[in-house]
């Protein structure tokens, strides 16, 4: 499963999709066994996982994945060189950073090697499929007696490409207060009560300048500020996902 296979053809993503027939489509029976959909996510622009539901296959089948970019030098499909497995059956492909081109149409082909006509070609805009790492190094500092500033860092992705969701609440609050912060990894809370204990957390997404990803990162580790003498209701500090 580690070999790279090149399937050469001009205009591959168009030509490979054709059924050589002059019969009108309504007379063609729909494929009896549709292939599972491929779902791809680019993790922090470090690697990409393209996965499919291998258990949807009626028989254990090692499906193969080939990919290419719409605008590429050699216009060839390349086989996955690092398959992911579920119960010893292929269920995904991991693609490394060098092979990720965010701003070219990504063409992915899933195929049953036993039945070459069982093939599905999908097209994806990878810039809409980026999931950043959770923000790190959350630090709190006092700007003034009652004003707090929260700062954080994001690894490997330019700050201007990210949008942040900040949530905070005090030990007296039943729900989070949340706000969107665009592109700048800091936020200030103008008025805090030093008799309360505050919890802050942040997550990020690749949106809207460099991409349109709807997927948020995981939440950062929470940070706390304020009185440690206040009696706290532990249930209020259960951080829901």
């Amino acid at each position: 499963w580690s070999s790279k296979v090149l399937m050469s053809s001009a205009n591959e993503d168009i030509k490979a999709d054709l059924i050589l027939t002059s019969t009108a489509p309504e007379h063609l029976s729909a494929p009896t066994l549709p292939l599972p959909e491929v779902q791809c996510f680019v993790f922090n622009i470090e690697y990409m996982n393209c996965t499919w539901n291998s258990s949807s296959e009626p028989q254990a089948t090692n499906l193969t994945l080939h990919y290419r970019y719409k605008v590429s030098d050699n216009n060839t499909f390349q086989e996955c060189s690092h398959y992911l497995f579920s119960k010893e059956i292929t269920s995904g492909c991991q693609i490394q950073k060098e092979d990720i081109q965010l701003y070219q149409t990504f063409v992915v082909q899933l195929q049953d090697p036993q039945k070459p006509q069982r093939r599905a070609v999908q097209k994806l805009n990878l810039q809409n499929l980026v999931i950043p790492r959770a923000p790190e190094n959350l630090t709190l500092s006092n700007l003034s007696e009652s004003q707090l500033e929260l700062r954080w860092k994001s690894r490997h992705i330019k700050e201007r490409c990210l949008q942040y969701l900040v949530q905070y609440r005090s030990n007296r609050d039943r729900s989070w207060t949340e706000l969107i912060v665009n592109h700048e990894p800091r936020f200030s809370l103008p008025s805090v009560d030093e008799l309360k204990r505050y919890t802050f957390r942040v997550r990020s997404r690749y949106n809207p300048i460099c991409g349109s990803s709807q997927q948020w990162s995981k939440w950062s580790q929470p940070v706390h500020w304020g009185s440690h003498t206040v009696e706290e209701n532990p249930s209020l500090f259960a951080l829901e996902a």
Epitope: I14, D17, A30, P34, Q39, Q122, L129
Partner: nanobody
Framework: QVQLVESGGGLVQAGGSLRLFCATS????????MGWFRQAPGREREFVAC???????FYADSVKGRFTFSRDSAKNTVYLQMNSLQPEDTAVYYC????????????????????WGQGTQVTVSS
């Protein structure tokens, strides 16, 4: 079951425009990837354009910049706006639908589509 009905085809002079419609009945389009394909007499069926229900659209190189794919989910209709038509665009145009779980899935392979319309004839005269 999804029924697809195309309309909007016709005879047009080279350089002209047409707008094709694909109306669906029986099911909302909100979880379907949609595609347009065409077939000229004696030719292979050809991918024209496709989209995902998340809003990504893709085009064959031969139509890029001239054709625009759009959908109106409220009306359960997809459209293909065709501008600067050329005689080589003459074909029967088919609309197709494929149920998908993921908002980002767009299929350019005809064998990925479960549902097809009857087609509408587009003739471009020189």
């Amino acid at each position: 079951q999804v029924q697809l009905v195309e309309s909007g085809g016709g005879l047009v002079q080279a350089g002209g425009s047409l707008r094709l419609f694909c109306a669906t009945s029986g099911r909302t389009l909100s979880r379907y990837a949609m595609g347009w394909f065409r077939q000229a007499p004696g030719r292979e069926r050809e991918f024209v354009a496709c989209d995902s229900w998340g809003g990504d659209t893709f085009y064959a190189d031969s139509v890029k910049g001239r054709f625009t794919f759009s959908r109106d989910s409220a009306k359960n209709t997809v459209y293909l706006q065709m501008n600067s038509l050329q005689p080589e665009d003459t074909a029967v145009y088919y609309c197709a639908a494929a149920p998908t779980s993921f908002a980002t899935t767009a299929y350019s392979s005809s064998n990925s589509y479960a549902y097809w319309g009857q087609g509408t004839q587009v003739t471009v005269s020189s």
